[in-house]
């Protein structure tokens, strides 16, 4: 850490006679440089160098030739690394009088005439005399105004807006300056600051639009940082709303976008009189072209109850916006003929959910269905298969003699989706078959006895039972089951030594 | 849909009082900047006053400063005028306004909704 | 106050006619100009925002153009509902203010 530079003459003001030369020495433990009251243009008689001394200090003097009205001020001498455009300048202070009688208050730019003030904060009116011995009284459209003042900064008060003008009498002689305007802006202890991008997803030769809005602040410095800001790629616009209320809307645009501007654009409030910061950012992505995801929530084969409602959600990522339509089995849904119905809803930016409800399902409702999204840039689709489950139900129940040789086949015909399993059960005591523990299932490898299954289609199938010869009566119950549900139907089969028995009589 | 509808106009006496009520429907009242608006029989428009979101802010006519007050009360969604110190020249049809948005919510749109507006007539 | 001057006060025009309305502002307001069109008995409904920006719903024959301190509102084809006052405002700066309005009537 270094102890701060030294100045001679050791004193912390210093009135020098006008057109007289004087010089102020600074000693440091680092390379010093010096700040002083005139600009560049305006200081050819002010004149800087390095002195050599064998301290082991480094030293820089300033030297004025004729002190003139104008060298009125404060010298700073700093060391080099620590001035930034942020800060105060931290280093040693002298403050040069140059009394002049017929220049009574040292010359400002015009710019200093403009006295911005932050709603009700005090401000200073910079009308500095070359003596620090003159008197000076600030007046206004009413009259003398009441402030303090300090011959080195001016008067310092809570203002009006309005013009103030500052008289001085040196020697009898009375001087006036031009009026300096009181202007007041508003500006908070705290930056309100909101971004909004009303697209953060573009494509390839689109232009990136981001705007920083400051609230109830007229007195901001505001800093974008974004992917082409090397390159100078962004156009920045700034636009003042004062009504509802005070806005400054800065705007950024990034016109034929690519993949590389791709990232975080930032903005960065700077309250300018206050060390009062905001930030905030959004990140933009640009695609080289149009892109489609589909993400639907269930399998490529679904079921459905006959009767039940059911929804088939498929979420979607796309831009540009996507046309979403659904199919059934290639062919284009026409909901008006159905119980089925689709919408699509934007969840986000680039996200869409697309629903198809099946309000009561019916047989027919299966089928494939499909799900296109297309942009001019992509399509995508997605195709699944929707069976509707229908419970087991017995169409038919037959019998069939083979003549004489008195074997006899039972055909049972049922229908259900997924398609039935059939069971055959028999019951030999005919008298008895009212209690369901006379009745056993037909194993397969019974003799005598063959057992069949015949699909007819999607939803039907047959089951076919042969016993190769039926010497008493017996009862025969066809079992037909899937998952929704079971049906059974029985059926008599008679001896046909019997049955001829019963014929004849 | 953005309904607003004013109540509380009536007949008052100079140097009356009176409170109108402006209630919303059909949009988020607490996002909006809301406004008053009149117009006296037979002439044209004049802005009354403009009230923030959140009531922190709220500027006036040179004409009804220190005696009207803007208000709202966003738990009901419901905006108020306070009307003190009456004068014949304030009667008028009050309508109660609101400020849209547009862009990326940057920008503004004057008055994009108006209720129906409610008499006061002032007059001894 | 910035003092917004409409004319004309009032216009006669036919169905079909091309009908134009100028608003002046006494100074600068960049384009923070609305228009209104109001029918007797009834609520002002806003026409036209930012100047030049048509509100939604508001058919397309309305168009609004200007800037600084010249605005004008143009009906490419008046239609029988279109018949009625009409108000520009500005909101570039408290308080704010409105045209006197122009009336139009059927000729």
């Known amino acids: 850490q270094l102890s701060l530079p030294s100045i001679l003459p050791n004193e912390n003001e210093k009135v020098v006679q006008l057109n007289s030369s004087f010089s102020l020495r600074c000693f440091g433990e680092s390379e010093v440089s010096w700040q002083y009251p005139m600009s560049e243009e305006e200081s050819s008689d002010v004149e800087i160098r390095n002195e050599e001394n064998n301290s082991g200090l480094f030293v820089t003097v300033l030297e004025v030739s004729s002190a003139s009205a104008a060298h009125t001020g404060l010298y700073t001498c700093y060391y080099n690394h620590t001035q930034t455009e942020e800060n105060e300048l931290e280093g040693r202070h002298i403050y040069i009088y140059v009394p002049d009688p017929d220049v009574a208050f040292v010359p400002l730019g015009m710019t200093d005439y403009l006295v911005i003030v932050e709603d009700d904060d005090s401000a200073i009116i910079p009308c500095r005399t070359t003596d620090p011995e003159t008197p000076v009284t600030l007046h206004n459209s009413e009259g003398v105004v009441p402030a303090s003042y300090d011959s080195r900064q001016g008067f310092n008060g809570t203002f009006t807006v309005g013009p103030y003008i500052c008289e001085a009498t040196v020697k009898g002689k009375k001087f006036q300056t031009i009026p300096f305007n009181v202007y007041a802006l508003k500006a908070t202890s705290e930056l309100d600051l909101e971004m909004e991008a009303l697209k953060t997803v573009y494509k390839s030769g689109e232009t990136i639009v981001v705007t920083c809005a400051v609230f109830n602040n007229e007195v901001v410095d505001l800093q974008w940082t974004y992917p082409g800001e090397v390159k100078g790629k962004g156009i920045t616009m700034l636009e003042e709303i004062k009504v509802p209320s005070i806005k400054l809307v800065y705007t950024l645009t990034v016109p034929e976008a690519t993949v590389k501007d791709s990232g975080d654009y930032e903005c960065a409030a700077r309250q300018a009189t206050r060390e009062v910061k905001e930030m905030k950012k959004v990140t933009i992505s640009v695609h080289e072209k149009g892109f489609i995801e589909i993400k639907p929530t269930f399998s490529q084969l679904e079921a459905v109850n006959l009767h039940e409602v059911k929804h088939f959600v498929v979420e979607v990522r796309a831009y540009p916006p996507p046309r979403i339509s659904w199919l059934k089995n290639n062919l284009t849904l026409i909901e008006n003929l159905t119980e089925i119905t689709t919408d699509v809803e934007k969840i986000q930016e680039i996200r869409y959910r697309s629903k198809l409800k099946l309000i009561r399902a019916k047989e027919e409702d299966s089928g494939h269905y499909t799900i296109v999204a297309q942009n001019e840039d992509a399509v995508k689709s997605y195709t699944f298969e929707l069976l509707t489950q229908v419970p087991s139900s017995i169409l038919d129940l037959v019998d069939d003699h083979h003549g004489s040789t008195g074997g006899q086949t039972v055909r049972c015909t049922a229908e259900g989706t997924p398609l039935p399993d059939i069971e055959w059960m028999i019951c030999k005591d005919i008298k008895k078959c009212n209690n369901e523990t006379s009745w056993t299932i037909l194993a397969n490898n019974v003799s005598n006895i063959i057992t069949e299954i015949h699909s007819r289609d999607r939803s039907t199938v047959e089951g076919r039972v042969t016993f190769a010869k039926v010497e008493e009566t017996i009862a025969v119950r066809c079992l037909a089951k899937n998952l929704l549900g079971a049906e059974n139907r029985e059926l008599k089969l008679v001896a046909p030594t019997l049955r001829s028995e019963l014929t004849v009589a | 849909e953005v309904q607003l509808v004013e109540s509380g106009g009536g007949l008052v006496q100079p140097g009356g009082s009176l409170r109108l009520s402006c209630a919303a429907s059909?949009?988020?009242?607490?996002?909006?900047?809301m406004s008053w608006v009149r117009q006296a029989p037979g002439k044209g428009l004049e802005w009354v006053a403009n009230i923030k979101q959140d009531g922190s802010e709220k500027y006036y006519v040179d004409s009804v400063k220190g005696r009207f007050t803007i208000s709202r009360d966003n738990a009901k969604n419901s905006l108020y005028l306070q009307m003190n110190s009456l004068r014949a020249e304030d009667t008028a049809v009050y309508y109660c306004?609101?400020?849209?948005?547009f862009g990326s919510g940057s920008y503004y749109i004057p008055f994009d909704y108006w209720g129906q507006g409610t008499l006061v007539t002032v007059s001894s | 106050d910035i003092q917004m001057t409409q004319s004309p006060s009032s216009l006669s025009a036919s169905v079909g006619d091309r009908v134009t309305i100028t608003c002046r502002a006494s100074?600068?307001?960049?384009?923070?100009l609305a228009w209104f069109q109001q029918k007797p008995g009834k609520a002002p409904k806003s026409l036209i925002y930012a100047a030049s920006s048509l509100q939604s719903g508001v058919p397309s024959t309305f168009s609004g153009s200007g800037s600084g301190t010249h605005f004008t509102l143009t009906i490419s084809s008046l239609q029988p509902e279109d018949f009625a006052s009409y108000f520009c405002q500005q909101y570039e700066i408290y308080p704010l203010t409105f045209g006197g309005g122009t009336k139009v009537e059927i000729k």
């Open positions: 306004a609101r400020w849209g948005v």
């Open positions: 059909g949009f988020t009242f607490s996002s909006y900047w």
């Open positions: 100074q600068g307001i960049r384009n923070y």
